[in-house]
């Protein structure tokens, strides 16, 4: 039941994401730590290290009101699940530093990625004999 | 804003395979899971299956057997291919874009494809 | 598979009406439900995912809510260009099933 909440919270996350792609040229173009093909059971520890980066509103036009409420719901904490516990006490998970660094729109579709690869798995895990590959 | 186009033969004879492709506009295919679905004459929708961008695919068990879903990612497109058809398979045809792995943001306006001979 | 039963079939109302489609599972499907607007010939549209959360630039009048088995579309004010088919669409587990439609159309 957390769990469910927890991925239910990640396909709105993917909404706001989205979202942000539309204004990354009003974003502070500094590179950010982006995991990419995460190593199973560390996905929590990657989504941590996403949420802490520090993307940043360039202050410019009308919609820096948006971006950063944008953001502000992007950091907001999940509710605590035994997994996501287990995962942030591996000692094996790469540090949010050892990640390469991107520039925001690279960074926010690593983001997407992580989230959907989280979202497939749980849709994977309740279904049996329809993946294929 | 993403596009989507579906294209492909109107008719196709019993026995044989359909073959459609779906071209993707205004964004990138390089991310996203990709889908066919389709609505036979007077009926409801049918998930037919999807491919993420990586190539990983899921398809509906009714149809697996028969299915093959591909993607194209340097033409930006993805295609379905439905062999041994029958007129159990006359349907409008819609690929569609899944950024939230299980619903369906984006949609083709869909292809009529008849199976007769 | 899971099944989805939409009610009623098809429903009359005017321009300014409260319209609501209801939306079963067979089984619980926790708030993965999405709701769509398909008219004739056009692409189908994207409303409501996760039960409740409105998609990007979809008018506020749509509104969904339930969790488990039983769930919503409510339009709060009906306007000239709501009218068109709904369908609900489960989002739990895959096969994915889609309800068999609610026509929506002028009294």
């Known amino acids: 039941q957390g769990q469910d909440r927890h991925m239910i919270r990640m396909r709105q996350l993917i909404d706001i994401v989205d979202q942000l792609k539309n204004y990354v040229n009003d974003l502070v173009p500094e590179f950010l730590p982006a995991p990419e093909d995460v190593e199973t059971n560390c996905e929590w520890s990657a989504f941590s290290c996403f949420q802490k980066a520090q993307l940043k509103s360039a202050n410019t036009g009308n919609n820096e009101r948006i971006i950063n409420v944008s953001i502000k719901k992007l950091k907001r904490k999940p509710p605590s699940t035994n997994a996501g516990r287990r995962q942030k006490h591996r000692l094996t998970c790469p540090s949010c530093d050892s990640y390469e660094k991107k520039p925001p729109k690279e960074f926010l579709e690593r983001f997407k990625s992580l989230l959907q690869k989280m979202i497939h798995q749980h849709l994977s895990s309740r279904t049996h004999g329809s993946e294929d590959s | 804003q993403v596009q989507l186009q579906e294209s492909g033969p109107g008719l196709v004879k019993p026995s044989e395979t359909l073959s459609l492709t779906c071209t993707v506009s205004?964004?990138?295919?390089?991310?996203?899971?990709w889908g066919w679905i389709r609505q036979p004459p007077g009926k409801g929708l049918e998930w037919i299956g999807y491919i993420s961008s990586r190539g990983s695919t899921n398809y509906n068990p009714s149809l697996k057997r028969r299915v093959t879903i591909s993607v194209d990612t340097s033409r930006n497109q993805f295609s379905l291919k439905l062999s041994s058809v029958t007129a159990a398979d006359t349907a409008v045809y819609y690929c569609?874009?899944?950024?939230?792995?299980?619903?369906?943001?984006?949609w083709g306006q869909g292809t009529l494809v008849t199976v007769s001979s | 598979d899971i099944q989805m039963t939409q009610s009623p079939s098809s429903v009359s109302a005017s321009v300014g009406d409260r319209v609501t489609i209801t939306c079963r599972a067979s089984?619980?499907?926790?708030?993965?439900l999405a709701w769509y607007q398909h008219k004739p010939g056009k692409a189908p549209k994207l409303l409501i995912y996760?039960?409740?959360s409105l998609q990007s630039g979809v008018p506020s009048r749509f509104s969904g809510s339930g969790s488990g088995t039983d769930f919503t579309l409510t339009i709060s004010s009906l306007q000239p260009e709501d009218f068109a088919t709904y369908y609900c669409q489960q989002a739990n587990s895959f096969p994915l099933t889609f309800g068999g439609g609610t026509k929506v159309e002028i009294k």
């Open positions: 996760v039960a409740s």
């Open positions: 089984q619980g499907i926790s708030s993965w």
């Open positions: 205004g964004g990138s295919i390089s991310s996203d899971f």
């Open positions: 569609a874009r899944s950024a939230g792995v299980a619903d369906f943001d984006f």
